[in-house]
């Protein structure tokens, strides 16, 4: 399977997950595929603590996360429940804005310059963050 006991080179370990931060931009789907080929997924933010960690690393730059509503309801790419989970939207977001003139609404979520979330056109070339969880078994203390 895909279990890991330590983070790959150039990834950052934090709270039993590994994170990789791009330095360039891709459309949301291309960023998603990049992460999947690396046995990871676009970052799923489950707490305020994780939000602050990611925000610290990305700085004030629009950055894709693993949250979208391309098929209707908002969904996290790893199956984490959206409705009951952590959220950090900007005021009046998400708004599925159609006024950008690019066709359709806004179906992909990103961190904005202040870290809060916005929905935007999935084709925009934003930076992205991949995340992969470390082997859950390795959290158990060794048997004596």
């Amino acid at each position: 399977g895909s279990e890991r006991t330590c983070c790959p080179v150039n990834w950052v370990e934090h709270e039993r997950s590994c994170y990789w931060f791009s330095r360039s931009g891709k459309a949301w789907a291309d960023a998603d595929n990049y992460c999947r080929l690396e046995d990871a997924h676009l970052v799923v933010v489950t707490s305020w603590e994780e939000q602050k960690f990611v925000q610290h690393h990305i700085g004030p730059v629009n950055t894709w996360m693993g949250l979208h509503d391309q098929n209707g309801p908002w969904k996290w790419v790893d199956g984490t429940d959206y409705e009951t989970g952590f959220k950090n939207w900007r005021p009046e977001q998400p708004d599925d804005w159609y006024g950008h003139g690019l066709g359709g609404g806004e179906d992909c979520a990103h961190f904005t310059d202040d870290g809060r979330w916005n929905d935007d056109v999935c084709q925009r070339p934003y930076r992205w963050v991949c995340e992969t969880e470390l082997d859950k078994a390795s959290q158990e203390p060794p048997l004596l």
């Epitope: 891709k26 291309d30 595929n33 990049y34 080929l37």
Partner: antibody
Framework: EVQVLESGGGLVQPGGSLRLSCAAS????????MSWVRQAPGKGLEWVSA????????FYADSVKGRFTISRDNSKNTLYLQMNSLRAEDTAVYYC??????????????WGQGTLVTVSS | DIQMTQSPSSVSASVGDRVTITCRAS??????LAWYQQKPGKAPKLLIY???SLQSGVPSRFSGSGSGTDFTLTISSLQPEDFATYYC?????????FGPGTKVEIK
């Protein structure tokens, strides 16, 4: 450094099946994404499929989707391409390549020497 | 799918010549472009990735440039071992696609 060597090519009738193998040397195989690229005789290169290091995530060109299956056995350091419902247009040299991650994207390096698949009656 | 085109399809040159090959993508691919060299009967070899980064072990006479849709591979002083076919490839999005190739022949 990973080195790769393909095998399993040969002559097969249209509608038939074939499984290609790619043996890799190098201690990082289980964490390396891998890919298949093909080249029809006298033609250019065509990406076929890719797979993540664990084998959990796979990607296919539309031309082979539903007919070809990429897989890997990390305990044997081996990559596979199961080819079903073969057509004349699948005739090509099939190359195995490591997917090299750098500068926020993926590149093919190194490549194997290729194995020839001929689909003909 | 992103279509890749190359020009010229073939070029005749002499040892010591400067050779330039161009590659164009049907839509913007930022700097996600690679160049490969293939000799007859051999596997392709990665020369340049991320549009301008020279792969380890590749001679410095090879260089790449460009961004967006237009890219260039330059061989500053052609050597006998450089006669081959050169392919560009976009690594921006699936399906990864290659250009049709440019054959560099001896004049």
């Amino acid at each position: 450094e990973v080195q790769v060597l393909e095998s399993g090519g040969g002559l097969v009738q249209p509608g038939g099946s074939l499984r290609l193998s790619c043996a890799a040397s190098g201690s990082t195989f289980s964490s390396d994404a891998m890919s298949w690229v093909r080249q029809a005789p006298g033609k250019g290169l065509e990406w076929v499929s890719a797979i993540s290091g664990s084998g959990d995530n796979t990607f296919y060109a539309d031309s082979v989707k539903g007919r070809f299956t990429i897989s890997r056995d990390n305990s044997k350091n081996t990559l596979y391409l199961q080819m079903n419902s073969l057509r004349a247009e699948d005739t090509a040299v099939y190359y195995c390549a490591k997917v090299y991650s750098a500068y926020d994207s993926h590149w093919f390096d190194p490549w194997g020497q290729g194995t020839l698949v001929t689909v003909s009656s | 799918d992103i279509q890749m085109t190359q020009s010229p399809s073939s070029v005749s040159a002499s040892v010591g010549d400067r050779v330039t090959i161009t590659c164009r993508a049907s839509q913007g691919i930022s700097s996600w472009l690679a160049w490969y060299q293939q000799k007859p009967g051999k596997a392709p070899k990665l020369l340049i990735y991320a549009a301008s980064s020279l792969q380890s072990g590749v001679p410095s006479r090879f260089s790449g440039s460009g961004s967006g849709t237009d890219f260039t591979l330059t061989i500053s002083s052609l050597q006998p071992e450089d006669f081959a076919t050169y392919y560009c490839q976009q690594a921006n999005s699936f399906p990864w696609t290659f250009g049709p190739g440019t054959k560099v022949e001896i004049k």
